[in-house]
């Protein structure tokens, strides 16, 4: 299914050394607190059956879930990185607010739902894992949306 042209982020969003560094530092600190190394949230299976040109829309869904269900509830943790990274990711989410897919997105929602279910099943450790994968989220958003 074709995607609207609104599924785009300017390259400059990912070329800011300071916030990029802070995002990766946050991910590193959270990953040190993640004791479940067998499970991966952002990996090949997230993109199963999703064409490359649909992946920005998929990553928008993952970003929104991560913000609403993980980062906002955990916003008091991993300071000072969290207070800088969350607004940055929220701005990216806002810029993708008009990103929609034409036609059926069930295959995408199914993949995103599996990620959500994994995080929920793991409870707080799932939220920590999601924060620990913010580097992968950042890189996947960059790859998918620029």
């Amino acid at each position: 299914a074709p995607i609207s042209s609104h599924c785009r982020l300017d390259k400059s969003n990912f070329q800011q050394p300071y916030i990029t560094n802070r995002t990766f530092m946050l991910a590193k600190e959270a990953s040190l607190a993640d004791n479940n190394t067998d499970v991966r949230l952002i990996g090949e299976k997230l993109f199963h059956g999703v064409s490359m040109s649909e992946r920005c829309y998929l990553m928008k869904q993952v970003l929104n879930f991560t913000l609403e269900e993980v980062l906002f509830p955990q916003s008091d943790r991993f300071q000072p990185y969290m207070q800088e990274v969350v607004p940055f990711l929220a701005r990216l989410s806002n810029r993708l607010s008009t990103c929609h897919i034409e036609g059926d997105d069930l295959h995408i929602q199914r993949n995103v739902q599996k990620l959500k279910d994994t995080v929920k099943k793991l409870g707080e450790s799932g939220e920590i894992k999601a924060i620990g994968e913010l580097d992968l989220l950042f890189m996947s958003l960059r790859n998918a949306c620029i």
Epitope: P2, I42, G43, E44, K45, F47, H48, S51, M52, S53, L136, M139, S140, N143, A144
Partner: antibody
């Protein structure tokens, strides 16, 4: 260093099953996908199918009914089995590794290929 | 399936020449096109993916451009080791499909 090496019989009789093995080193099969591609003599490349890092598979629908791709992670091997072969399956068969988890349909590292001839 | 059409099928050029190979997809693939180099007795080599991203270790004389359905591979100044066959591949969706190849020969 990432390496892939295809192996298998160079000659297969019509109607029999073609069996090939791709032995990999320098990476883990649980972290990267491995694809199979073939090339008919003097022709272009044709994607056959893929072994995902979690053990799932994706096949080209042109082969689905007679194709099986499997793996043995303890041996670092991915196998291809193509049944009911005909002369049209005569080709060089390649295995190739994906670039990374995101660019999983980009074939970054290839084996040198193994030639299979279908003939009685 | 998406059909990939390369042109020309063969091209003769000299060392130092600028060479352009084109690839056309039968439907839009956004920017998701890869280019590979094939030489006899050697493993195929990824040159470019996502239309214009140079694979690590590939010389900067190779460049890719295009989006939608029309793409080009350019070699800015041919070197002796560049004489080979080049294939495009759409990596947007399954099944992955390739062009029929362009053979780059010494003039």
């Amino acid at each position: 260093e990432v390496q892939l090496q295809e192996s298998g019989p160079g000659l297969v009789k019509p109607s029999q099953t073609l069996s090939l093995t791709c032995t990999v080193s320098g990476f883990s099969l649980t972290s990267y996908s491995v694809h199979w591609v073939r090339q008919h003599p003097g022709k272009g490349l044709e994607w056959i199918g893929r072994m995902w890092s979690d053990g799932d598979t994706s096949y080209n629908t042109a082969f689905t009914s007679r194709l099986t791709i499997s793996r043995d992670t303890s041996k670092n091997q991915v196998s291809l089995k193509l049944s009911s072969v005909t002369a049209a399956d005569t080709a060089v068969y390649y295995c190739a590794r994906s670039l990374d988890f995101y660019y999983d349909t980009t074939l970054a590292f290839w084996g040198q290929g193994t030639t299979v001839t279908v003939s009685s | 399936d998406i059909q990939m059409t390369q042109s020309p099928s063969s091209v003769s050029a000299s060392v130092g020449d600028r060479v352009t190979i084109t690839c056309k997809a039968s439907k839009t693939i956004s920017k998701y096109l890869a280019w590979y180099q094939q030489k006899p007795g050697k493993a195929n080599k990824l040159l470019i993916y996502s239309g214009s991203t140079l694979q690590s270790g590939v010389p900067s004389r190779f460049s890719g451009s295009g989006s939608g359905t029309d793409f080009t591979l350019t070699i800015s100044s041919l070197q002796p080791e560049d004489f080979a066959t080049y294939y495009c591949q759409q990596h947007n969706e399954y099944p992955l499909t390739f062009g029929q190849g362009t053979k780059l020969e010494i003039k």
